[in-house]
């Protein structure tokens, strides 16, 4: 036999205290699907959270984070402090990236610079705390016999004049 409550619409609940008639969700609660026997309490965006979307009778409130913080987790379940580019968040707060690592965002961890030599390439632009290195063409690409539609400009090494 079908549940007598199955047809109560979203925004209502099947009220057992009133012989299973449909009743509207009370203030600050919602039901996003039909046939509910209770309404869920609306999420409240407090403290470091701020309201992105108000709660309605059929949908929960949605939160994001106040400036200086960013969302983490499903549905922005946590707010984490922003750091500057070139930093990462540690237990002791924001710390500069160690030499050889970078972070180009306000969140996340510092990552190692790309090792250009692993691809047989040279470093065209040095890395910084905020930016990865830029790898240049491999020596093979610079040899006179290398076939290229538009040959790359030769990389200048510090202290060397062009041949």
């Amino acid at each position: 036999l079908q549940d007598p409550c199955s047809n109560c619409p979203a925004g209502t609940f099947c009220d057992n205290n009133r012989n299973q008639i449909c009743s509207p969700c009370p203030p600050n609660s919602f039901s996003s699907a039909g046939g509910q026997r209770t309404c869920d309490i609306c999420r409240q965006c407090k403290g470091v959270f701020r309201t992105r979307k108000e709660c309605s009778s059929t949908s929960n409130a949605e939160c994001d984070c106040t400036p200086g913080f960013h969302c983490l987790g499903a549905g922005c379940s946590m707010c984490e402090q922003d750091c500057k580019q070139g930093q990462e968040l540690t237990k002791k707060g924001c710390k500069d990236c160690c030499f050889g690592t970078f972070n180009d965002q306000k969140r996340g961890i510092c990552r190692p610079w790309t090792n250009c030599s692993l691809d047989g390439k040279s470093v065209l632009v040095n890395g910084t705390k905020e930016r990865d290195v830029v790898c240049g063409p491999s020596p093979a690409d610079l040899s006179p016999g290398a076939s290229s539609v538009t040959p790359p400009a030769p990389a200048r090494e510090p202290g060397h004049s062009p041949q």
Epitope: L1, P4, C5, P9, R18, Q20, C22, G35
Partner: nanobody, 121 residues
Framework: EVQLLESGGGEVQPGGSLRLSCAAS????????MGWYRQAPGKRREFVAA???????VYAESVKGRFTISRDNAKNTVYLQMSSLRAEDTAVYYC???????????????WGQGTLVTVSS
């Protein structure tokens, strides 16, 4: 407190028409299904028609094409327009507030007190 108050009953000749009204209060009318039932003398109460909050309707075979159920959510009222009335339509007609907004296999949560319809020449 849920209240259902029927009106519009009376005596009518075969082939005639009547419109029953049911004024509802004490609950959120617009989100609930409403129904009409009837009980003839010496018989069991039987389903006549029902209307969902979304205005889907269901009718008993015996009244299809002759009776029309409708609702006015602004007035918290449900109606039963009855035409081509027959002697066998004679009964006390009850308004019912249905459980869970269901018109298929409906179950009544609250009843009105009824209004008598007599079809007689």
């Amino acid at each position: 407190e849920v209240q259902l108050l029927e009106s519009g009953g009376g005596e009518v000749q075969p082939g005639g028409s009547l419109r029953l009204s049911c004024a509802a209060s004490g609950f959120s009318f617009s989100i609930n299904a409403m129904g009409w039932y009837r009980q003839a003398p010496g018989k069991r109460r039987e389903f006549v028609a029902a209307i969902e909050s979304g205005r889907n309707t269901v009718y008993a075979e015996s009244v299809k094409g002759r009776f029309t159920i409708s609702r006015d959510n602004a007035k918290n009222t449900v109606y039963l327009q009855m035409s081509s009335l027959r002697a066998e339509d004679t009964a006390v007609y009850y308004c019912g507030l249905l459980k869970g907004n269901r018109v298929v296999s409906p179950s009544v949560a609250y009843w009105g007190q009824g209004t008598l319809v007599t079809v007689s020449s």
